[in-house]
C-alpha cells in the first residue's frame, strides 16, 4: 500500500506540474479535476500546489489562480461567476471523455471561495479503506 500511495502521489504531483501544457493529453488532468470536484479539495498537499503552474500563474501583481474544480460552489452567492464561468466548466466534469483545449482552461483567483484543504489525506483515507 505504501508503494501505491507513493506512485499515486508522484502521478498527481506531475499532473499538477504539467497542467495545461499539452492540449492533446488531458485525460489525467480531467481525472484530477474530477477528483477535486468530487472530494471537495484543491491540490495534492495544499491549494498552493497550483501556484507554481505556469499556465495558471498571473503576471506580476495578478492574483494566483487555481482550476475551477477547486471552486466551492456552496460558499458563494456570486451568480455572475457561477452562471458564466464555473457551472459550464463543472458540468463538463461529468463527461470526462470530451477533449479540452488549453484555451478552455477554467481558473479562478485563489483568494476566492475555493476548497481550503489538499486532496491527499482524503485519497489516502480512501485507499486505506479499500
Amino acid at each position: 500500500r505504501a508503494q501505491l500511495e507513493r506512485s499515486l502521489r508522484d502521478v498527481v504531483e506531475k499532473t499538477i506540474q504539467k497542467y495545461g501544457t499539452n492540449p492533446e493529453e488531458t485525460a489525467a488532468e480531467e481525472s484530477w479535476d474530477y477528483v477535486q470536484f468530487q472530494l471537495r479539495c484543491c491540490g495534492w498537499h495544499y491549494p498552493q500546489d497550483w501556484f507554481q503552474v505556469l499556465i495558471l500563474r498571473g503576471n506580476g501583481s495578478e492574483a494566483h489562480r487555481v482550476p475551477c474544480s477547486c471552486y466551492n460552489l456552496s460558499a458563494t452567492n456570486d451568480s455572475t461567476i457561477l452562471d458564466k464561468v464555473i457551472l459550464p466548466q463543472l458540468s463538463r466534469l461529468g463527461h470526462l471523455a470530451r477533449s479540452r483545449h488549453s484555451a478552455d482552461i477554467c481558473a479562478v483567483p485563489a483568494e476566492s471561495h475555493i476548497y481550503r484543504e489538499g486532496c491527499a489525506q482524503g485519497l489516502q483515507k480512501w485507499l486505506h479503506n479499500n
Partner: antibody
C-alpha cells in the same frame, strides 16, 4: 539518531551565488518533506523554501522566488539550496529542517545546526 | 513585520506559570490546526515543543501545553524552571502563497 548537517555558507558579494547543502542521516530521507528556514542576526525565524519527498513539488517564499532553487538527491540523502542574485538582506543563518511524521504539515521536528551566509561587499 | 503577533518578552519566577500568545488571522492560526511552537536557546537551533496546536513531541516536558481560541494560539509553561529561559516562536500553515508564517518571537526571562 536523526542528524541534519548544513554546509556551504560563507561570505559572498551582493549579486553573487552560493549553494547550501544539508546532509541527512538516521532516517529514511526519501520519505520526508524538507524545508529551509533562515534567521537574520538578532531577528526571528523566516521560512524560505519547502520540497516534497519526491522532489517534484517545490514552494518558495515570495522574497526568494526566481533567485533561490530548492532540490534534493534522495540517493545521496541530501537537500540543497542554490542561491543566486544574493542581496545584503539575505544575510542569515540558514537551517534545514525535517517535517514531522512523513507528512506535509509544516511542523519541523529536527533541525540542523545552521550555516551562516553573509552577503557583503 | 511578522505575520503572527507575539509579545516581545514575558517573564516569570521559578515555579510560576506563564502564557505566550500568538495572534494571526482566519487564513492561518484561526483557519487551521497546524500551529506549532519552537524553543530556541542562544546560538542553538530551534526545538519543536508543540505541534497541531496542543500536541507534545516525545521527550518534551508536560509542563509545556498549547491551546487555541479563534485567531489566537497560546503556549503555557507551568512550573517555570531556569532552563526554560529562551526565545519562543509560534508558526502556522497559511492559505496565502507564503505557506508558512512565524511569529516575531518572545523572549522568556526566568527571574
Amino acid at each position: 539518531q536523526v542528524q541534519l548537517v548544513e554546509s556551504g555558507g560563507g561570505l559572498v558579494k551582493p549579486g553573487g551565488s552560493l549553494r547550501l547543502s544539508c546532509a541527512a542521516s538516521g532516517f529514511t530521507f526519501s520519505d520526508y518533506y524538507m524545508t529551509w528556514i533562515r534567521q537574520a542576526p538578532g531577528k526571528g525565524l523566516e521560512w524560505v523554501s519547502y520540497i516534497s519527498s519526491s522532489g517534484i513539488t517545490k514552494y518558495y517564499a515570495d522574497f526568494v522566488k526566481g533567485r533561490f532553487t530548492i532540490s534534493r538527491d534522495n540517493a545521496k540523502n541530501s537537500l540543497y539550496l542554490q542561491m543566486n542574485s544574493l542581496r545584503a538582506e539575505d544575510t542569515a543563518v540558514y537551517y534545514c529542517a525535517r517535517d514531522r511524521d512523513r507528512q506535509w504539515l509544516l511542523e519541523f521536528d529536527y533541525w540542523g545546526q545552521g550555516t551562516l551566509v553573509t552577503v557583503s561587499s | 513585520q511578522s505575520a503572527l503577533t507575539q509579545p516581545a518578552s514575558v517573564s516569570g519566577s521559578p515555579g510560576q506559570s506563564i502564557t505566550i500568545s500568538c495572534t494571526g488571522t482566519s487564513s492561518d492560526v484561526g483557519g487551521y490546526n497546524y500551529v506549532s511552537w519552537y524553543q530556541q536557546h542562544p546560538s542553538k537551533a530551534p526545538k519543536l515543543m508543540i505541534y497541531d496546536v496542543s500536541n507534545r513531541p516525545s521527550g518534551v516536558s508536560n509542563r509545556f501545553s498549547g491551546s487555541k481560541s479563534g485567531n489566537t494560539a497560546s503556549l503555557t509553561i507551568s512550573g517555570l524552571q531556569a532552563e526554560d529561559e529562551a526565545d519562543y516562536y509560534c508558526s502556522s500553515y497559511t492559505s496565502s502563497s507564503t505557506l508558512v508564517v512565524f511569529g516575531g518571537g518572545t523572549k522568556l526571562t526566568v527571574l
